[in-house]
Interface confidence: medium
């Protein structure tokens, strides 16, 4: 008789995530020497650790706690780079500003990119059919338990000035529930930070509105100023100039604002 | 699944008109710049119009400034291409793509095919 | 008379490494981002390349770059199907429009 398996709402584990996770450690590891020391089969054993046999709605920061040890990395802390609903600009940024580091630039954050993973309570299975979705099921679930550590923690690490990339395009340019709001913002070291610079990236060509005065912004503002955080802001006009301004400075085009 | 389908192609007198249809699927249509790209038989891609995500600009090429008209309706997830007073030199296979200013026409739809003829 | 220029066509053996050029000016490929497109026969195009880089489920044998006022597409350990016409992209500046190469057919021997 096939055993109950517990049906959740979230897509299950991605396939091949064993494989993937421990694939992914090799690529970083070569391509980032100062990681080179990482023994990536212990990587994957303190991952599998984490979320193994354990019920996929109790899942604590604890877990992770060998998996952030083993995963430990100095990143420049006046060169982060967060973002919040706009992922895929942000990391072709740092693709091409090479000294700036998202999350997902870092070992751990680079190896749980687009990844969905979760365990049965005791039993050593990986559950490939569902997982728990942070809505309709649980939050303290793998995936978001995951995200939420990994993110506090870089948050903490930052200092000077700290950049944050957010879509304009969004009714919500900044909101409280989004990792960013709810996890990053707070978890900014004051007497590290001096100014958290936000990018607000337009997303269309008609769209002259100054975007750093949406009332999203000014809360966003308001919280980082209680936290005694200068704030700033800047309109992101054209993001494709942007990116090509970051690439070649001295482009005749690149001298009018962006 | 993301997906666009156009319809409405066909054959029609020059002179006449047409109207072509683009539907989106499986993604946020207001987040995205949308475009209409042609191909005439054995001929390479043309750019034809674009309208920004809340359709307060749009764009044509030369080659049809004053005869087709772009247009949206957000809340139907749908694009349009008014085609007016069409010449023989406007038959061509018509495709609608999806644009984000930092990722390219990474979405395109199967195409429509108009031929002008008497 | 296309805005960017592209040779007509290339061919290489299977294997072998090829380079697609696409020449423009200061207006498009200089102050933009360029886009490549592979048009497989019979079939919509498709976003192969952009900002140098690849979208999710594009193999890393296509690589993009770009230096001043001109833009290349190569093509490593080249495959049969790869054989397809390939098109530069970029917005122009000038012209207030999108501008495409007029398309390189590549053909795999």
């Known amino acids: 008789v096939p055993r109950w398996r517990q049906q959740w709402s979230g897509p299950g584990t991605t396939k091949r995530f064993p494989e993937t996770v421990l694939a992914r450690c090799v690529k970083y590891t070569e391509i980032h020497p100062e990681m080179r020391h990482v023994d990536c089969q212990s990587v994957w054993d303190a991952f599998k650790g984490a979320f193994i046999s354990k019920h996929p709605c109790n899942i604590t920061e604890e877990d992770y706690q060998p998996l952030m040890k083993l995963g430990t990395q100095t990143v420049p802390c006046n060169k982060i780079l967060l973002w919040s609903r706009i992922k895929d600009l942000a990391h072709q940024f740092t693709q091409v500003q090479r000294d700036m580091f998202t999350l997902e630039d870092t070992l751990l954050g680079y190896l749980a990119d687009d990844l969905t993973w979760c365990g049965e309570f005791n039993t050593s299975k990986i559950n490939y059919q569902s997982c728990p979705d942070w809505r309709k099921d649980c939050s303290n679930n793998p995936v978001s338990v995951f995200w939420k550590t990994v993110s506090r923690r870089f948050a903490e690490a930052a200092c000077d000035v700290v950049h944050v990339m957010l879509n304009g395009s969004r009714s919500k340019i900044f909101d409280k529930n989004s990792t960013f709001g709810s996890v990053e913002v707070h978890n900014l070291q004051p007497e590290k930070v001096q100014t958290l610079e936000a990018w607000v990236i337009h997303g269309g060509r008609e769209d002259s509105r100054d975007l750093c005065q949406d009332p999203t912004i000014k809360e966003l503002e308001s919280i980082i100023s209680k936290r005694n955080i200068q704030f700033s802001c800047k309109n992101i006009y054209r993001p494709d100039k942007f990116l090509q301004c970051v690439k070649n400075p001295e482009d005749s085009s690149c001298t009018s604002e962006i | 699944e993301v997906q666009l389908l156009e319809s409405g192609g066909g054959l029609v007198q020059p002179g006449g008109s047409l109207r072509l249809s683009c539907a989106a699927f499986?993604?946020?249509?207001?987040?995205?710049?949308m475009n209409w790209v042609r191909q005439a038989p054995g001929k390479g891609l043309e750019w034809v119009s674009s309208?920004?995500?809340?359709?307060?600009?749009?764009g044509y090429a030369d080659s049809v400034k004053g005869r087709f008209t772009i247009s949206r309706d957000n809340s139907k997830n749908t694009l349009y291409l008014q085609m007016n007073n069409l010449r023989a030199e406007d038959t061509a296979v018509y495709y609608c793509?999806?644009?984000?200013?930092?990722?390219?026409?990474?979405?395109w739809g199967q195409g429509t095919t108009v031929t002008v003829s008497s | 008379q296309s805005v960017l220029t592209q040779p007509p066509s290339a061919s290489g053996t299977p294997g072998q490494r090829v380079t697609i050029s696409c020449s423009g000016s200061?207006?498009?490929?200089?102050?933009?981002?360029v886009n490549w497109y592979q048009q497989l026969p019979g079939t919509a195009p498709k976003l192969l390349i952009y900002?140098?880089q690849r979208p999710s489920g594009v193999p890393d044998r296509f690589s993009g770059s770009k230096s001043g006022t001109s833009a290349s597409l190569a093509i490593s350990g080249l495959q049969s199907e790869d054989e397809a016409d390939y098109y530069c992209?970029?917005?122009?500046?000038?012209?207030?429009?999108?501008?495409f190469g007029g398309g390189t057919k590549l053909t795999v021997l």
């Open positions: 793509a999806n644009y984000k200013s930092y990722y390219g026409m990474d979405v």
């Open positions: 499986g993604f946020t249509f207001s987040d995205y710049e």
């Open positions: 309208i920004s995500i809340t359709g307060s600009w749009t």
């Open positions: 200061s207006s498009n490929i200089r102050n933009n981002l």
């Open positions: 900002n140098a």
């Open positions: 992209a970029a917005w122009d500046d000038s012209l207030n429009a999108w501008v």
